[in-house]
């Protein structure tokens, strides 16, 4: 992984593109920290395991987060 101690935030670019929840392998939400002052959202896609940085401010991404949390609450007993 191209990481050095000087890298602060994970995302070089962020995407506004809608993501189909069915194509998601994993969704990581990284809270602000001493290294990176803002939230970062990283989607891991089922196809090839591609990882994509998403824009937390985008309406499409906010809808995705809602859909994913809804799905999780359905699954939990």
């Amino acid at each position: 992984i191209p990481l050095s101690r000087t890298v602060r935030c994970t995302c070089i670019s962020i995407s506004n593109q809608p993501v189909n929840p069915r194509s998601l392998e994993k969704l990581e939400i990284i809270p602000p920290s001493q290294f990176c002052p803002h939230v970062e959202i990283i989607a891991t896609m089922k196809k090839k395991g591609e990882k994509r940085c998403l824009n937390p401010e985008s309406k499409a991404i906010k809808n995705l987060l809602k859909a994913v949390s809804k799905e999780r609450s359905k699954r939990s007993p």
Epitope: I1, P2, L3, S4, T6, V7, R8, C9, T10, C11, I12, S13, I14, S15, N16, Q17, C36, P37, H38, I42, K48, E50, K51, R52, C53, L54, N55
Partner: antibody, heavy 124, light 109 residues
């Protein structure tokens, strides 16, 4: 359509300074990391510098560290390269390029939009 | 620092032929971090492939990328007249830095 336009190139004496600009249109500039890449006459491509979408990280090729500074003004959709202590070997076409949507340290989507370049000649 | 080597330096082929371009890294590179670009004389480079094998938007399917570890390949299945150009591989490495290979020129036989 997505477009990048560089400006600020010219002929400059060794040891002097120059500031390049790159103006973006057709996409949300503040969402994308940006690069400067150069190409010396008759040579291949050489990556120069990158700045994250939010300006939180900046990195440089060793040969320009301490002399060049990459910066951006998201309110003006503009990327800059401040070049100080210029040397003959900095003579090149300088391209700005957009980092692909969603790129991060775990997956790289490539430089997907390029400007046409601005020429910098360092000569006495 | 990872060094990329491209071979051959020049590839002389005729339209309709298959072109196979090689990119070798001095150390193992994750396929997630390898890209290919095309550059025609007097023009800016154009992204062809990212993630070693995914075609960029608008790139015809005659272009394909493959490989892993230290050996990567760009294949043009049937050369069209507009494909004669210089091709560069590029990797995103630690520090982080973005290194280009020296390029392979595909010219008309």
């Amino acid at each position: 359509q997505m477009q990048l336009v560089e400006s600020g190139g010219g002929v400059v004496q060794p040891g002097r300074s120059l500031r390049l600009s790159c103006t973006a249109s057709g996409f949300t500039f503040s969402n994308n990391g940006m690069h400067w890449v150069r190409q010396a006459p008759g040579k291949g491509l050489e990556w120069v510098a990158v700045i994250w979408f939010d300006g939180m990280n900046k990195f440089y090729v060793d040969s320009v560290k301490g002399r060049f500074t990459i910066s951006r003004d998201n309110s003006k959709n503009t990327l800059y390269l401040e070049m100080n202590s210029l040397r003959a070997e900095d003579t090149a076409i300088y391209y700005c390029a957009r980092e692909g949507d969603g790129s991060g340290i775990y997956y790289y989507y490539g430089m997907d939009v390029w400007g046409q370049g601005t020429t910098v000649t360092v000569s006495s | 620092e990872i060094v990329l080597t491209q071979s051959p330096g020049t590839l002389s082929l005729s339209p309709g032929e298959r072109a196979t371009l090689s990119c070798r890294a001095s150390q193992s590179v994750s396929s997630s971090y390898l890209a290919w670009y095309q550059q025609k004389p007097g023009q800016a480079p154009r992204l062809l492939i990212y993630g070693a094998s995914s075609r960029a938007t608008g790139i015809p399917d005659r272009f394909s990328g493959s490989g892993s570890g230290t050996d990567f390949t760009l294949t043009i299945s049937r050369l069209e007249p507009e494909d004669f150009a210089v091709y560069y591989c590029q990797q995103y490495g630690s520090s982080p830095i973005f290194t280009f290979g020296p390029g392979t020129k595909v010219d008309i036989k």
